[in-house]
């Protein structure tokens, strides 16, 4: 939960941030985890810390590996671990994908970039931009700030782009660039009353007293990205969370998926150690957006073991 | 502006449950160095500290009252919840909530409290 | 723990006069340069009301007649010029440690 992947290129800065985080008066202690080492805070070093951030300048190959943050408050220290690589650069155009930040979408009435990670670093305008490595021209494309704006996107706009600027750091200058994939979406989405999908309405769930046991919440939305859309357990008609049995929980975050070009949400209920009370339980699987609310209930019922007798 | 309730049962006998919820706006519990805190003042006494919730789940509790105690949070809804097992008439209180805001970390809001009172 | 032991318990001051209320700690209340060390002022059936955090610095919306300084175990609030009010109950707070504590109080009274 408290690491982060990054990533950068020989003889480019790269500033890290620490995946923990504290508020201005917390003091940041950094360290090379394979040695516990501490990562020195002056300046004239090339790797030095400075507060939550931990900056390469410039990145070396060897410098890959993992480093520890320790974010320390006065009553409680908050450790985290930034997993750092270090590539060689290509000498040809392609950019691998270990070295491309997330995919953006954009459409006809939403068309911006943003440059990845960049307000980590000391920069200056303008950012140059290119696509699969050239350097793009013309009226319709906009740098803006630290992002690109395209003019009329047209499914031809998909592709990788890759932002190039300057860091400073007293006074010397660095070149760091960052790459991600660009795709062209249909704006035609649209929204509907929540259609669960599963479970069925008044299912009855088998479950084995002292086994674990899993529910899906699953529900379609619509088309597109939608504004505001959800999907949740309740137990007896409050949220897991005010329910107050650790061994019934929610999946941390939705999970998102297109199917068929629908946006549909999925909670799964994770139940430890089913016990007999567990069955007198009402599950409600709710799914909600801006067309209003449905409910599906489910019931567990206890599953006989099979007998094994010939 | 930022703002703090508490509410609770206002009565329980000894050995029952204490909950209490804070609800709170004007601020939220996802945003980093935020916290939430539970204090409580009997009739005409001091304050006690009991407990409370950082931005990123981390808990810290009253050692005294640890193994009664239990906080959580429900960020979506801008609530903190503080469950005491076990009442005693020694836990009849004023029980306030507050925000744990600011550089530094002090109670920088505070809502007007709830009584409880623990009787047979 | 962190003791806090305030004096006086109680405080009579003419009007337009100076308070000082002084909190003692246990054991240093200092992390990195800073001395975590709170005051808070609570009227009756009102919950308190924040005045001075980390030792010295004035919450927004305090008047300036109310000043913390100190460091390490000893601190003090003043109200200068002391009025009508600011009859009430003052606490100190350290959030140095866990268990978060607090002083016995001090009652502002005026002569």
């Known amino acids: 939960k408290f690491s982060k992947q990054s990533w950068g290129l020989e003889n480019e800065a790269l500033i890290v941030r620490c995946p923990r985080q504290g508020k201005p008066s917390y003091t940041v202690d950094w360290y090379y985890s394979q040695t516990n080492k501490s990562i020195p805070t002056q300046e004239r070093n090339r790797v030095f810390a400075s507060g939550q951030l931990l900056k390469f300048l410039p990145a070396a190959v060897a410098d890959s590996g993992i480093y520890t943050c320790i974010v320390r408050s006065p009553t409680f220290n908050r450790t985290g671990y930034a997993n750092v690589t270090i590539y060689k650069k290509q000498s040809d155009c392609n950019v691998p994908d270990y070295l491309m930040y997330s995919t953006v979408s954009g459409s006809e009435k939403n068309s911006k970039i943003y440059c990845p990670t960049i307000d980590l670093y000391n920069w200056t305008a303008p950012l140059e931009w290119f696509k699969n490595c050239q350097a793009l021209q013309g009226s319709r494309y906009r740098a803006h700030k630290s992002f690109l704006v395209i003019d009329n996107v047209m499914t031809e706009d998909a592709g990788d782009y890759t932002c190039k600027f300057i860091h400073n750091e007293n006074g010397a200058n660095y070149s760091v660039t960052a790459t991600r994939s660009f795709t062209v979406k249909d704006e035609q989405g649209f929204s509907l009353f929540p259609v669960i999908g599963a479970p069925a309405q008044n299912e009855i769930k088998e479950v084995e007293i002292g086994k674990n046991a899993n529910l899906t919440c699953s529900a379609c939305f619509g088309k597109g990205t939608q504004f505001l859309a959800a999907v949740l357990w309740q137990l007896n008609g409050t949220k897991i969370t005010d329910f107050g049995e650790p061994r019934i929980q929610q999946e941390e975050g939705q999970n998102q998926s297109f199917s068929n070009g629908l946006a549909c949400l999925d909670m799964v209920l994770r139940i430890a150690d089913v016990k007999e009370e567990d069955l007198l339980l009402q599950y409600d699987c709710l799914a909600l957006n801006l067309h209003g609310l449905r409910r599906h209930t489910v019931r567990l019922s206890r599953k006989n073991p099979i007998d094994h007798h010939s | 502006q930022v703002t703090l309730k508490e509410s609770g049962p206002g009565i329980l006998q000894p050995s029952q449950t204490l909950s209490l919820t804070c609800s709170f706006s004007?601020?939220?519990?996802?945003?980093?160095?935020?916290?939430v805190g539970w204090i409580r003042q009997p009739s005409g006494k001091g304050l006690e500290w009991l407990a409370h919730?950082?931005?990123?789940?981390?808990?810290q509790y009253n050692p005294a009252l640890k193994s009664r105690l239990t906080i959580s949070k429900d960020t979506s809804s801008s609530q903190v919840f503080l469950k005491s097992a076990s009442v005693d008439t020694a836990d009849t209180a004023t029980y306030y909530c507050a925000r744990i805001g600011g550089d530094y970390d002090y109670f920088d809001f505070w809502g007007q409290g709830t009584t409880l009172t623990v009787s047979s | 723990d962190i003791v806090l032991t305030q004096s006086p318990a109680s405080l009579a001051v003419s009007l337009g006069q100076r308070a000082t209320i002084s909190c003692r700690a246990s054991e240093s209340v200092e992390y990195s340069g800073t001395s975590l060390m709170q005051w808070y002022q609570q009227k009756p059936g009102q919950p308190p009301k924040l005045l001075i955090y980390v030792a010295s610095n004035v919450e927004s919306g305090v008047p300036a007649r109310f000043s913390g300084s100190g460091s390490g175990t000893d601190f003090s609030l003043n109200i200068h010029p002391v009025e009508e009010d600011d009859i009430a109950m003052y606490f100190c707070?350290?959030?140095?440690?866990?268990?978060?504590?607090f002083g016995g109080g001090t009652k502002l009274e005026i002569k």
């Open positions: 919730i950082w931005w990123d789940d981390v808990k």
């Open positions: 004007g601020f939220s519990l996802s945003t980093s160095g935020m916290g």
């Open positions: 707070q350290q959030s140095r440690k866990v268990p978060w504590t």
